[in-house]
Amino acid sequence: QQQTLPKPFIWAEPHFMVPKEKQVTICCQGNYGAVEYQLHFEGSLFAVDRPKPPERINKVQFYIPDMNSRMAGQYSCIYRVGELWSEPSNLLDLVVTEMYDTPTLSVHPGPEVISGEKVTFYCRLDTATSMFLLLKEGRSSHVQRGYGKVQAEFPLGPVTTAHRGTYRCFGSYNNHAWSFPSEPVKLLVTGDIENTSLAPEDPTFPADTWGTYLLTTETGLQKDHALWDHTAQNLLR
């Protein structure tokens, strides 16, 4: 006899990276007929929803209207059908950004390079942090982690046209509290014409929308739960 129900999916909308004082919604999707959903934060009960009518609802939304460092951390959810509880969802790491200071991102030898050249990004922040994160804008949300007292190196090695795109970095005060994003650095990698045409740049945010990047749902990242659970969260483990 089944002792538990399948685990629900959990994700954040519009994004798991939330600027301080902005709103975020934590979504938990279970099964139709679930009479209760519970959201747990850092291992303790945070909120409860008992949807009505339960047979017509399979997803609930927990709003956090004012993101701050106390609300950043690990969330999970469970649901109940009758007296039977589900397995807990995967952990959702909610990160608060725009904390304290803004790092500086630079690239060596420069932002315009030839395919095959070795490229290194440098992220610098003169405040108390030793962990840095380099993000390439775009649906794939590539994230690299680096360490250093005031600066971290991110060697990309010999680059290809697949590396071209817009990069930003963050200083990380802890796993769930990040700095403001750096100004963007656009890496242009030139190669032979055939290669360039076969390796289009990742889809990116328009240049003027990064400041509100968390207000733009990244459909590919947010809705594909398997991808969400497997990649975007792994950097925080």
Epitope: T25, L45, A47, D49, Y63, I64
Partner: nanobody, 130 residues
Framework: EVQLVESGGGLVQPGGSLRLSCAAS????????MAWFRQAPGKGLEFVAA????????YYADSMKGRFTISRDNSKNTAYLQMNSLRAEDTAVYYC???????????????????????WGQGTLVTVSS
């Protein structure tokens, strides 16, 4: 901006009853989930009960179930905590709290964690003693 003022606290004998009130100012109160918390002398803040903005959903700490009842009257911008069968260990300062007011909350959601609450009253003291 929401202001909360509790009243109804006082001295009561074990086994007795009290009804606490939480009067809110601010137009958004009727759309906000809210809760009661308490803090006993020398102890941390403890969740007591929570209610959805519609009043249709409630949730209680295990030790309060069956003895305490949370309710609200949105037409009066007031929430209540009816406390029956009071015990000495219920002695505490009782606080009402409301969540932040910039989100469209589900009519059935309640928040049990103090970190979810943006607005707090000044508290009312309940003393249970013979």
């Amino acid at each position: 901006e929401v202001q909360l003022v509790e009243s109804g606290g006082g001295l009561v004998q074990p086994g007795g009853s009290l009804r606490l009130s939480c009067a809110a100012s601010g137009r958004t109160f009727s759309r906000l989930p809210m809760a009661w918390f308490r803090q006993a002398p020398g102890k941390g803040l403890e969740f007591v009960a929570a209610i959805s903005w519609s009043g249709g959903s409630t949730y209680y700490a295990d030790s309060m179930k069956g003895r305490f009842t949370i309710s609200r009257d949105n037409s009066k911008n007031t929430a209540y905590l009816q406390m029956n069968s009071l015990r000495a260990e219920d002695t505490a300062v009782y606080y009402c709290a409301a969540v932040g007011d910039s989100a469209p909350y589900s009519a059935t959601i309640v928040y049990t964690d103090a970190r979810a609450y943006a607005y707090w009253g000044q508290g009312t003291l309940v003393t249970v003693s013979s």
